[in-house]
Amino acid sequence: TQNKALPENVKYGIVLDAGSSHTSLYIYKWPAEKENDTGVVHQVEECRVKGPGISKFVQKVNEIGIYLTDCMERAREVIPRSQHQETPVYLGATAGMRLLRMESEELADRVLDVVERSLSNYPFDFQGARIITGQEEGAYGWITINYLLGKFSQKTRWFSIVPYETNNQETFGALDLGGASTQVTFVPQNQTIESPDNALQFRLYGKDYNVYTHSFLCYGKDQALWQKLAKDIQVASNEILRDPCFHPGYKKVVNVSDLYKTPCTKRFEMTLPFQQFEIQGIGNYQQCHQSILELFNTSYCPYSQCAFNGIFLPPLQGDFGAFSAFYFVMKFLNLTSEKVSQEKVTEMMKKFCAQPWEEIKTSYAGVKEKYLSEYCFSGTYILSLLLQGYHFTADSWEHIHFIGKIQGSDAGWTLGYMLNLTNMIPAEQPLSTPLSHSTYV
């Protein structure tokens, strides 16, 4: 029944988000008759590919085809057969592949080449696989949430209940947390963006936007944890690391070779007198928070103000949508409500981290231990990043909205990417180069 011709005149598009920890495929749909050349796209399907991110296939590229099969077959089922040939497929790889490219451009190219060959075997209109820049990732995330919130257009939309804005046109900032990088993107208030690398100018729906964006490579939650472990093992007196970011009673053996595998830990690398060490959780939020803060260099700033590591950050302005891992982690911790104050979040994190590992395992029996064990670190990291990294305060905390989906579409960079690549962001093209896509022929 899925493949019956649809009475409505619609088009489809597919975007694969090849992240550092996993790959997700998104199917988008929009009416063929576009309102004023501005299509209205929404997500009809998300398929999470089983397995790790594509960068992990560097030694087994022959397995990439099988890895992508299930989700590509799902796309075949969801999209009517008559539309297959005209449905574009794009794959964007993010920070996991940026890190692999830093290690070896040749290996990164080999992975992308096999991905491209695999995706070309399907009956869709494959448009290419590429590593998107951190700047693009931030910009497209910002476009996605503001598009879905109706911040760009005052038109009534074609599906269900959708934005017809009467005022309220202030855009939301975007906070995106992945496994290997994190992005902050917003429109500053009458503030010069002092660093050209962080400035984007574009015109959307007849309005000019001067947008600040930065992507912090190695500051996604997984790579931040590797960084913290590499930093802390430097001062450990033996092969036992008593770690405040894990629950009391938690134990895990880590290979030193795995620790130093990522470029993110290079700055902490040293010759250790052991090949393995054991993490022993002590579950102390305050100490965990202090350890995390050591990852942020706030002693140097060549601008009027900085986030950390000498990166310019204008004063925060307006509301922010925090999505991806910001949302997943805070949802697990039951801390996504707008009225949960920053003080209350901190209090709850203190209690959560102090809970014994055996108790935690019993309370969350359905959750994989690998993920479960890291929520104390991840929650503490999110607080540290937002408060000390980006300078949110107890007062401005209430302007952070933890968002999973808006109008049924995932908050994230893929929808913005789709909007741009299908030319459904108005004919007046964005002025900034990262959004121009000259890569595609």
Partner: antibody, heavy 118, light 108 residues
Framework: PVQLQQPGAEVVMPGASVKLSCKAS????????MNWMRQRPGQGLEWIGE????????NSNQRFKGKATLTVDKSSSTAYMQLSSLTSEDSAVYFC???????????WGTGTSVTVSS | EIVLTQSPTTMTSSPGEKITFTCSAS???????LHWYQQKPGFSPKLLIY???NLASGVPTRFSGSGSGTSYSLTIGTMEAEDVATYYC?????????FGGGTKLEIK
């Protein structure tokens, strides 16, 4: 069209349980939270709780803890609310409604009238 | 929990008149989390305005919303006979989600 279908009425005995259903159509069921509301005769609306069909995560109004249990069946795009240990106080119309960011309810079911009577 | 107080409980108006319903919150709410519904007797509630000022699909433009902090309002620019109903405000800012007690609009 986006629709939430609910049975019209249920009559149940005091002390018994009832499982109310809400069948979704016209949209991707797992992409929106499902909420449940109660409206007693001639009264206003009370929020009971919500469930995310993608991962079965729930939030409930403490007032209904132990009274209402929310579940979903992804394969049939149906949300359920089980009400237990019913008393005459539970006689009301129960609505399901789809939730979106900002926690507003954009699509409502037709409502199921529950009468608790012996 | 956040208590929403709507006033008045009942109001009587004539077609063509401008009407304003108010909703007062017991603590401050971010405007993204305040919404309005219309319910006619024997029917399900219907979303009118979401996130303070956004008109839901299919809702006539005579309806508008505004407000911030603890004070919000719904306005009908020119009342029509079909607007006879009960109007509820609702907050999604914190758990539990709560509704105001409603304002019943009657026709003169």
């Amino acid at each position: 069209p986006v629709q939430l279908q609910q049975p019209g009425a249920e009559v149940v005995m005091p002390g018994a349980s009832v499982k109310l259903s809400c069948k979704a159509s016209g949209y991707t069921f797992t992409s929106f939270w499902m909420n449940w509301m109660r409206q007693r005769p001639g009264q206003g609306l009370e929020w009971i709780g919500e469930i995310d069909p993608s991962d079965f995560y729930t939030n409930s109004n403490q007032r209904f803890k132990g009274k209402a249990t929310l579940t979903v069946d992804k394969s049939s795009s149906t949300a359920y609310m089980q009400l237990s240990s019913l008393t005459s106080e539970d006689s009301a119309v129960y609505f399901c409604a789809r939730g979106d960011f900002g926690w507003y309810f954009d699509v409502w079911g037709t409502g199921t009238s529950v009468t608790v009577s012996s | 929990e956040i208590v929403l107080t709507q006033s008045p409980t009942t109001m009587t108006s004539s077609p063509g008149e401008k009407i304003t319903f108010t909703c007062s919150a017991s603590s401050s709410i971010n405007s993204n989390y305040l919404h309005w519904y219309q319910q006619k007797p024997g029917f399900s509630p219907k979303l009118l305005i979401y996130r303070t000022s956004n008109l839901a699909s299919g809702v006539p433009t005579r309806f508008s919303g505004s407000g911030s902090g603890t004070s919000y309002s719904l306005t009908i620019g020119t009342m029509e006979a079909e607007d006879v109903a009960t109007y509820y405000c609702q907050q999604g800012s914190s758990l539990p989600r709560t509704f105001g007690g409603g304002t019943k609009l009657e026709i003169k």
